[in-house]
């Protein structure tokens, strides 16, 4: 759709005559009829296929025609067309004399024609005014013409419709060729797609207006490039939503079970060496002079009964000192001044001479010990029971009474109540001081997770458009992770599909 514009500029008819050569009375009151039609190889009479237009009387004999366009007048003359501009045309301009006020063709005598021109033209849309002049023996007509597109029509032949808009159906202005030019922040065929915040993750983020970055379920951060870990995840991270990948030293569904108690709590005291021996479990290896589960107890050096032959031990600042009974001497009262003749062996011990009678040794019966068999054997003196176990003498032997959670001859083995997998339905087992505790997955409860309480929230396939369903184990609900191009709690709404013809 467009307009052929014809600007009449000057008409010269100095003698004031008609085409027949007869003069006009009193002068030639001149008006024009214009016929625009399709290009003809030979211009020939026929219908004005592109339109016609007539002017009022513009002057007498010779005159210049005023440009009236600014005042809403009729010069340039407008010949609108509602088709693709073909680029070529035939143009016929007739100058007529109006003896009276009636300018209708049927009201004029046939010999009222002053002059007639007929040309074949070629004209591109939007070209500058093309000036032409047609001269005959009696008249001269100067005129110019051009073709422009109607509002909202563009292109080489005014065939492209484009209406600028800034609404739900598009955000654009029109280029001279009719192509869309998106407003800042918009893209796509119809400029309906907002350009999200720079760096906004292509899959995990989206936007409804420019420079925005809205995260899809399971993602967070300014650019939606950080996954949201499982609800309740304590010491863990994720690489996809709702994961809980435990940090080093942590375990369990929520990464809240301490697998590295030694590092996280440093329980061993007095420079002892700590060894992890299971979940929330450890063993301290004490430095000399210390004892207790956490090596928190300082040992008296006399506790190891270093003094022999009935010597009595006295603690000192820097160690201990043995007070020897008569007949003995040495750091530990280990040297005797007695011989077998003195019957030094008690409790039925038998005496043997040594070093040609200068010394002796007692061979003690069972349950007795010491240089002179003077001590009843106490098998608990060396604290053989680990992990706080209590040592009990039982005649010739001894036994360890272990604290709860420990077993073995010397209470050296940690008993895990969880070892027999007591938690049903994938429950996670936690060892406690006095027993165990089960953490149940969604859908199960009870002391051993034996009671079914709900079903998998994703079992009913609630997500549309091939979205991924995640069950939120802490709330028994589902979350849909939408593929690109869909939004909504169930990914049921498509994002920004272009309409077929928005106008």
């Amino acid at each position: 759709s467009g307009v052929f514009q014809l600007q009449l500029q000057e008409f010269i008819n100095e003698r004031g005559v008609l085409a027949s050569g007869r003069p006009c009375e009193p002068g030639c009151r001149t008006f024009f009829r214009v016929c625009l039609k399709h290009f003809q190889a030979v211009v020939s009479p026929g219908p004005c296929t592109f339109g016609t237009v007539s002017t009022p009387v513009l002057g007498t004999n010779s005159f210049a025609v005023r440009d009236d366009s600014s005042g809403g007048g009729r010069n340039p003359l407008q010949l609108p067309f509602n088709f693709t501009w073909p680029g070529t045309f035939s143009l016929i301009i007739e100058a007529w004399h109006a003896p009276g006020d009636d300018l209708r063709p049927e009201a004029l005598p046939p010999d009222a024609l002053i002059s007639k021109i007929a040309i074949q033209g070629s004209l591109a849309v939007g070209q500058n005014w093309l000036l032409d002049e047609q001269t005959s023996t009696l008249t001269r007509l100067r005129y110019s013409y051009r073709v422009i597109c109607s509002d909202n029509y563009y292109g080489d032949n005014c065939s492209r419709l484009c209406k600028k808009r800034n609404d739900h159906f598009g955000h654009y202005v029109c280029q001279p060729d009719g192509n869309l030019s998106c407003l800042p922040g918009w893209t796509g065929e119809y400029c309906q797609q907002p350009i999200c915040l720079s760096g906004c993750h292509e899959q995990n983020g989206y936007c409804s207006k420019p420079a925005e970055c809205l995260c899809r379920p399971g993602w967070q951060g300014r650019l939606c490039n950080e996954c949201i870990p499982h609800n309740g995840c304590r010491h863990g991270t994720c690489s996809t939503p709702w994961q809980c990948t435990c940090d080093e030293g942590w375990g369990g569904l929520f990464c809240d079970q301490d697998l590295n108690y030694c590092t996280h709590h440093s329980p061993c005291k007095n420079g002892a060496t700590c060894s992890n021996s299971g979940q929330r479990s450890y063993t301290c290896t004490c430095r000399p002079g210390y004892t207790g589960v956490d090596c928190e107890l300082e040992l008296s050096e006399c506790d190891s009964n270093p003094c022999r032959n009935g010597g009595s031990c006295k603690d000192q600042e820097d160690g201990y000192h043995c007070l020897c009974p008569p007949g003995y001497y040495g750091l530990h009262c280990e040297h005797s001044t007695l011989s077998c003749a003195d019957s030094p062996c008690f409790n039925g011990g038998s005496c043997r001479e040594r070093n040609q009678g200068a010394n002796y040794a007692c061979e003690c019966p069972p349950n007795f010990t010491g240089s002179n068999c003077e001590k009843k054997v106490d098998r608990c003196t060396s604290n053989p029971c680990a992990n706080g176990g209590q040592c009990l003498n039982r005649g010739p032997s001894r036994m360890c009474r272990c604290r709860p959670g420990f077993t073995g001859t010397y209470c050296e083995l940690h008993v895990s109540d969880c070892a027999r997998n007591p938690c049903a339905h994938g429950g996670t087992c936690h060892d406690l001081e006095n027993g165990l505790m089960c953490t149940c997955p969604a859908g199960f409860s009870g002391r051993r997770c034996e009671v079914r309480t709900s079903i998998d929230a994703c079992a009913s396939s609630p997500c549309f458009n091939r979205a991924t369903c995640y069950t939120d184990l802490s709330t028994d609900t589902f979350v849909c992770n939408c593929p690109y191009g869909f939004v909504g709690s169930r990914c049921e709404f498509p994002v920004g599909l272009p309409p077929s013809f928005p106008w």
């Epitope: 026929g46 021109i117 074949q120 033209g121 070629s122």
Partner: antibody, heavy 118, light 107 residues
Framework: EVQLVESGGGLVQPGGSLRLSCAAS????????MYWIRQAPGKGLEWVAF????????YYRDSVKGRFTISRDNSKSTLYLQMNSLRAEDTAVYHC???????????WGQGTMVTVSS | DIQMTQSPSSLSASVGDRVTITCRAS??????LAWYQQKPGKAPKLLIY???RLQDGVPSRFSGSGSGTDFTLTISSLQPEDFATYYC?????????FGQGTKLEIK
């Protein structure tokens, strides 16, 4: 009196060139589209080329496209036809004509003979 | 291209006869057709243009009719000077195309 007078014809070898002229008088030459039309000996009429009144539009028949060029000089009221790479089948009487049936105009020249032969 | 088929290609008639020549276009040319008369060694002379309009100075015994694709030239009463070759020409689209011609001879 309206006159169109062609000149420039003659005998030329195949592959040769000729330039035909058509001098107009007795009418306003610059107002009209002009045509070259030829007639081979004993044959019918055949249109060759067209140029619009201002020279902005030209058309040619397929068999002469790229070889013939039509032009005009309105200040001299003269029409031209530059013929290159001539062939035997171009042998004919060449007429220039001013045709505008809307205005009842139909002016023809008497023609100039072009013979292409070795 | 638009083909113009003219018939007959030749015709013998006597002075005073009514003669009809037809021309058929291969596509619609509206009324953009002319009829020419040519005598040996002369330039063609326009008789009828726009299918049915008589050119100034042409005797009224010549008339044209038709539109679209079928056209007719009629000579109502043949005169001795009318014996010549007649051509139709379509002026609707380039390339301009003529009919093959009809040679009108004295019987």
């Amino acid at each position: 009196e309206v006159q169109l007078v062609e000149s420039g014809g003659g005998l030329v070898q195949p592959g040769g060139s000729l330039r035909l002229s058509c001098a107009a008088s007795g009418f306003t030459f610059s107002n009209y589209g002009m045509y070259w039309i030829r007639q081979a000996p004993g044959k019918g009429l055949e249109w060759v080329a067209f140029i619009s009144h201002g020279g902005g539009i030209t058309y040619y028949r397929d068999s002469v496209k790229g070889r013939f060029t039509i032009s005009r000089d309105n200040s001299k009221s003269t029409l031209y036809l530059q013929m290159n790479s001539l062939r035997a089948e171009d042998t004919a009487v060449y007429h220039c004509a001013a045709l505008n049936w809307e205005l009842g105009i139909d002016y023809w020249g008497q023609g100039t003979m072009v013979t292409v032969s070795s | 291209d638009i083909q113009m088929t003219q018939s007959p290609s030749s015709l013998s008639a006597s002075v005073g006869d009514r003669v009809t020549i037809t021309c058929r276009a291969s596509e619609d040319i509206y009324s953009n057709l002319a009829w020419y008369q040519q005598k040996p060694g002369k330039a063609p002379k326009l008789l009828i243009y726009a299918a049915n309009r008589l050119q100034d100075g042409v005797p009224s015994r010549f008339s044209g009719s038709g539109s679209g694709t079928d056209f007719t030239l009629t000579i109502s009463s043949l005169q001795p000077e009318d014996f010549a070759t007649y051509y139709c020409l379509q002026g609707s689209k380039f390339p301009l195309t003529f009919g093959q011609g009809t040679k009108l001879e004295i019987k």
